[in-house]
Interface confidence: low
């Protein structure tokens, strides 16, 4: 009753904060400056309220802190006098999702700020091309994602729905494989994975080039170009050339845009052009032998895109070799 002359109660405000799994976040809360500051951060679930962090009488009070928050929370102590009651929250887990309430009391008022913390995860997905016996498959895979993403496939820019989805992780984060059987198809395919909470999208695009027929000891040029629609100029990416043989992939060349370094794993392999413009990653394979027949895969990948280009090379015996036999 004594306090009522000085004390006003301000209703609750609400804010949404989106964090990423394993990263740190600040849950914001501000108040009008006053003396005798008391701060209580609490987490509310369907059944209970848990103490996250408390401050009163000029220092942090962690005696009643719930163990799940031990060594993971702190306030900006030097800024409390300026009206900053924000909570610094380390190493987010999906279990941290939910409603956080910040109660701030001063000599003249009390406020309650409500922060809804949503935690998302989106580890860079991959697009893989696999051959199993006589069948060919495209797999869009995301190792860790939350909440469930939207996965869409397109064939020649037309949406298609017939894909086989596998998901692990019942509560999240989820690991998701979406597989498409592309046996015998010459179409181009695109897979998009979107996490709408984090507003993050990844796209994988697969293109099969026309088969190349070459003679023994000739050279072959394998095209692979970066499409500007997909990659922004300052985006880091990597280029991997590999060969598919009996379902196993062996790397032939590797390029990193950040360092502009190329590593060749096959001496007969070289770039078609100098990589000055960093957009044409076509390759030359010289001195062809019969055993060079097969599928060659160019993979250009960034955090947001994967472009896969497949070439089928058929090497035939040269006339001299044929007449020798």
């Amino acid at each position: 009753i004594f306090l009522s002359a000085f004390f006003t109660y301000v209703p609750m405000n609400e804010q949404i904060i989106i964090g990423r799994l394993g990263e740190d976040i600040i849950l914001p809360s501000s108040f009008e400056r006053g003396s005798e500051v008391v701060i209580h951060w609490k987490y509310q679930d369907s059944y209970n309220s848990y103490n996250v962090h408390s401050y009163y009488k000029g220092s942090g009070r962690l005696e009643s802190q719930d163990t799940r928050y031990a060594n993971r929370t702190s306030l900006f102590y030097n800024e409390i006098q300026n009206g900053n009651a924000s909570l610094f929250f380390r190493r987010l887990s999906l279990l941290d999702e939910g409603i956080y309430t910040c109660y701030v009391g001063t000599a003249i008022q009390a406020i309650t700020n409500k922060v809804v913390l949503k935690v998302g995860v989106f580890l860079t997905p991959m697009m893989k091309y696999e051959k199993r016996n006589t069948n060919s498959f495209l797999i869009c895979n995301v190792l860790s994602v939350y909440p469930r993403p939207i996965i869409t496939w397109k064939m020649d820019n037309t949406p298609i729905s017939e894909n086989n989805m596998q998901e692990t992780g019942s509560l999240g984060p989820f690991s998701i494989n979406s597989t498409l059987n592309i046996t015998g198809s010459n179409s181009s395919y695109e897979c998009t994975i979107e996490n709408s909470l984090l507003k993050q999208t990844w796209t994988g695009r697969w293109t099969m080039k026309d088969g190349l027929h070459k003679m023994q000891s000739e050279h072959v040029s394998l095209s692979c170009e970066l499409v500007n629609d997909y990659f922004s100029p300052n985006q880091d990416f990597k280029v991997t050339w590999s060969r598919m043989e009996s379902g196993i992939s062996s790397i032939l060349a590797y390029y990193l845009s950040s360092s502009q370094n190329t590593t060749f794993y096959e001496s007969r392999f070289s770039w078609n052009k100098e990589l000055k413009n960093q957009s044409d990653f076509s390759m030359n394979l010289t001195d062809l032998s019969l055993s060079d027949s097969g599928e060659y895969l160019c993979n250009i990948s960034s955090d947001e895109y994967t472009l896969l280009t497949i070439h089928t090379v058929h090497v035939e015996p040269s006339q001299e070799t044929a007449s020798d036999n």
């Epitope: 609400e14 949404i16 939910g98 809804v116 709408s196 909470l197 507003k199």
Partner: antibody
Framework: QVQLVESGGGVVQPGRSLRLSCAAS????????MHWVRQAPGKGLEWVAV????????NYADSVKGRFTISRDNSKNTLDLQMNSLRAEDTAVYFC?????????????WGQGTLVTVSS | DIQMTQSPSTLSASVGDRVTITCRAS??????LAWYQQKPGKAPKLLIY???SLESGVPSRFSGSGSGTEFTLTISSLQPDDFASYYC?????????FGGGTKVEIK
């Protein structure tokens, strides 16, 4: 197919209350954010409120904050809008709309709307 | 809150015309913009999302472009069925907002 059916509209006096409902079917209701959007006669669209898929968060347009309350019952596939202290400027067709996904996005599906008239 | 300014508010055009509607955001919204078509007495219909992606079933004469703060909706060849009102909507922030609308009427 997805269906959203609003009900509860009508004529009400200024200062009184009204409760709108939206019955959803044809999709997993608990996976999607739900919104109320209104349109005054002859005017444009105005977003009113959202409730997240799991009910943990509600956001309101400044024009209705403190007067309107959005709620949902995921077991019954229903969305409600409790409107208190109604004003003449709240007169509009109220649409319920389904978010594209679980977070704030665009609206793929809309109800047919229910008319609320605030008049003395 | 992010404000969306649409122009023009009314547009008179003929069948076969190329029509462009502009939407400007008060701050950058990346590509988080949708376009809707609405006919009198009906609910809005989604045309474009993520600034330029065409919603399934929407005719290809509709296209969207832009990012950041400037966006456009283009109808390449206006058809009789296209006379309607059009709205942009941002969903970059967690309070969505619509533009004021553009009414496309017969000249």
């Amino acid at each position: 197919q997805v269906q959203l059916v609003e009900s509860g509209g009508g004529v009400v006096q200024p200062g009184r209350s009204l409760r709108l409902s939206c019955a959803a079917s044809g999709f997993t209701f608990s996976n999607y954010g739900m919104h109320w959007v209104r349109q005054a006669p002859g005017k444009g669209l105005e977003w009113v409120a959202v409730i997240w898929y799991d009910g943990t968060n509600k956001n309101y347009a400044d024009s209705v904050k403190g007067r309107f309350t959005i709620s949902r019952d995921n077991s019954k596939n229903t969305l409600d809008l409790q409107m208190n202290s109604l004003r003449a400027e709240d007169t509009a067709v109220y649409f319920c709309a389904r978010d594209r996904n679980t977070a704030m996005d665009y609206f793929v599906y809309w109800g047919q709307g229910t008319l609320v008239t605030v008049s003395s | 809150d992010i404000q969306m300014t649409q122009s023009p508010s009314t547009l008179s055009a003929s069948v076969g015309d190329r029509v462009t509607i502009t939407c400007r955001a008060s701050q950058s919204i990346s590509s988080w913009l949708a376009w809707y078509q609405q006919k009198p007495g009906k609910a809005p219909k989604l045309l474009i999302y993520k600034a330029s992606s065409l919603e399934s079933g929407v005719p290809s004469r509709f296209s969207g472009s832009g990012s950041g703060t400037e966006f456009t909706l283009t109808i390449s060849s206006l058809q009789p069925d296209d006379f309607a009102s059009y709205y942009c909507q941002q969903y970059n922030s967690y309070s969505v907002t619509f533009g004021g609308g553009t009414k496309v009427e017969i000249k």
